[in-house]
C-alpha cells in the first residue's frame, strides 16, 4: 500500500517517501523507485537552515553599509549572514535591518545601559544626590559634590542637572 | 518465492527487433518497479530501462532512448522491453531486476539477445 | 552521469583471508551505493544496500561502509563460496551506473 505519512526527514509525493535535502542543499529532483531524492549544494552566497525540498537556495542576507550595517556573523550554506551595526548605532529591529543612531541622555537624565549593537541606551532620571549636566550615551548620573569633605559649604543647592557649589565657611570674627 | 522469468532473446540482424519479457511471480507485481540491466559477454553491468509501479513512469539511459520502450502489464503480471534498431553493441544478457528500496533486490536468469549479420 | 571506478580490477587471495574492494564515485552520492555479486552464469545477487545495511540470507561476512564518494565492501574471512565478481551501483541519480567490478580470485 502506498504510505500516507512519512518518517521524519522525508516528503510524500507521487505516493512515495522521499528523502528530505540535508541543510546547505536544495532539491534538484525528486525521489524515484529507484533512485533517492537528488539534492545540490547552495552556490557561494546561499543557504538553506533547514531540511527542505526548496528548488532555490535563499540568498544570504546584504549587510548595507549605507544603512549603518556590517557583517558580525558571516553566512555558510546552512546559516543567514548576522548583521549588526557600526560603532554608535544599534537595530531598529530583531531583523537588524537598518540602524539608527544610539539615543543620547539629555541633562537631568543619566546612562541606566550603555546601546549595544541591537538595543538603544537606557536612561534614567538622576535621582536626589545625583546629576547629569551633558547630553551623553555614555554618561551616569554623577553624586553631588560633597562639600563637607572638603571642609567646605554648600553655597548653592544642587539638581539633577546641576552639581553643588561649594564655598569656603563663614569665619568667625 | 519470488520469481522472475525473462524470455523473448534470440538472434537478430542489425536494424532489426525484439521484444523481451520478464513474467514475474511470488510478489505483488503492481507495487515493485522493475528494471532492465543488461551484461556483454565479459563486461559488466549496463542498466537499459525502469518504470515504475503504475507503469507511468519510464527511464532510458541516452544510448537506447529512442530505440528501447519498457513496458508492464500489471494484470499479466508481465514486463516487457521493446527494442528496435538493434546494434552489435546491444548483444548482451539482458535480465530483469525488481526494486526493492531502490536496490535491484531480485533478479532474473536472463535471456541471450545477439546481434550479427 | 556519475561514474564508479572499483579497484583493484582482480583480487587473488586465499580462502580464510579478508578482502577489501573499493568502489570511488566521480561526485558524492551520499550513501546512495548497492552491492552486488555475480558467479559465473549467474544473475547477480544483492549484498548490502544503502552503503552499509545488511541483507536478509547474506553472510554477516560481508560489510560494507563508506559515504560521499568512497565506499568499502569487505568479507572478513573468505569463503571458497566467495570467490566471484563484486559490482557496486549507485542510485543517486540517473542514469543508474555500476562498476566495472572486481573479481576476487583464489590464489
Known amino acids: 500500500e502506498p504510505p500516507t505519512a512519512c518518517r521524519e526527514k522525508q516528503y510524500l509525493i507521487n505516493s512515495q517517501c522521499c528523502s528530505l535535502c540535508q541543510p546547505g542543499q536544495k532539491l534538484v529532483s525528486d525521489c524515484t523507485e529507484f533512485t533517492e531524492t537528488e539534492c545540490l549544494p547552495c552556490g557561494e552566497s546561499e543557504f538553506l537552515d533547514t531540511w527542505n525540498r526548496e528548488t532555490h537556495c535563499h540568498q544570504h542576507k546584504y549587510c548595507d553599509p549605507n544603512l549603518g550595517l556590517r557583517v558580525q556573523q558571516k553566512g555558510t550554506s546552512e546559516t543567514d549572514t548576522i548583521c549588526t551595526c557600526e560603532e554608535g548605532w544599534h537595530c531598529t529591529s530583531e531583523a537588524c535591518e537598518s540602524c539608527v543612531l544610539h539615543r543620547s541622555c539629555s541633562p537631568g537624565f543619566g546612562v541606566k545601559q550603555i546601546a549595544t549593537g541591537v538595543s538603544d541606551t537606557i536612561c534614567e532620571p538622576c535621582p536626589v544626590g545625583f546629576f547629569s549636566n551633558v547630553s551623553s550615551a555614555f554618561e551616569k548620573c554623577h553624586p553631588w559634590t560633597s562639600c563637607e569633605t572638603k571642609d567646605l559649604v554648600v553655597q548653592q543647592a544642587g539638581t539633577n542637572k546641576t552639581d553643588v557649589v561649594c564655598g569656603p565657611q563663614d569665619r568667625l570674627r | 518465492e519470488v520469481q522472475l522469468v525473462e524470455s523473448g532473446g534470440g538472434l537478430v540482424k542489425p536494424g532489426g527487433s525484439l521484444r523481451l519479457s520478464c513474467a514475474a511471480s511470488g510478489f505483488t507485481f503492481s507495487n515493485y518497479g522493475i528494471s532492465w540491466v543488461r551484461q556483454a559477454p565479459g563486461k559488466g553491468l549496463e542498466w537499459v530501462s525502469s518504470i515504475s509501479s503504475g507503469g507511468d513512469n519510464t527511464y532510458y539511459p541516452d544510448n537506447v532512448k529512442g530505440r528501447f520502450t519498457i513496458s508492464r502489464d500489471n494484470a499479466k503480471n508481465s514486463l516487457y522491453l521493446q527494442m528496435n534498431s538493434l546494434r552489435a553493441e546491444d548483444t548482451a544478457v539482458y535480465y530483469c531486476?525488481?526494486?526493492?528500496?531502490?536496490?535491484?533486490?531480485?533478479w532474473g536468469q536472463g535471456t541471450l539477445v545477439t546481434v550479427s549479420s | 552521469e556519475i561514474v564508479l571506478t572499483q579497484s583493484p580490477a582482480t583480487l587473488s587471495l586465499s580462502p580464510g583471508e579478508r578482502a577489501t574492494l573499493s568502489c570511488r564515485a566521480s561526485q558524492t552520492i551520499n550513501n546512495n551505493l548497492h552491492w552486488y555479486q555475480q558467479k559465473p552464469g549467474q544473475a547477480p545477487r544483492l549484498l548490502i544496500k544503502?552503503?552499509?545495511q545488511s541483507i536478509s540470507g547474506i553472510p554477516a561476512r560481508f560489510s560494507g561502509s563508506g559515504s560521499g564518494t568512497d565506499f568499502t565492501l569487505t568479507i572478513s574471512s573468505l569463503e571458497p563460496e566467495d570467490f566471484a565478481v563484486y559490482f557496486c551501483q549507485q542510485f543517486s541519480s540517473w542514469p543508474l551506473t555500476f562498476g566495472g567490478g572486481t573479481k576476487v580470485e583464489i590464489k
Open positions: 544503502y552503503a552499509s
Open positions: 531486476a525488481r526494486a526493492g528500496e531502490k536496490a535491484m533486490d531480485y
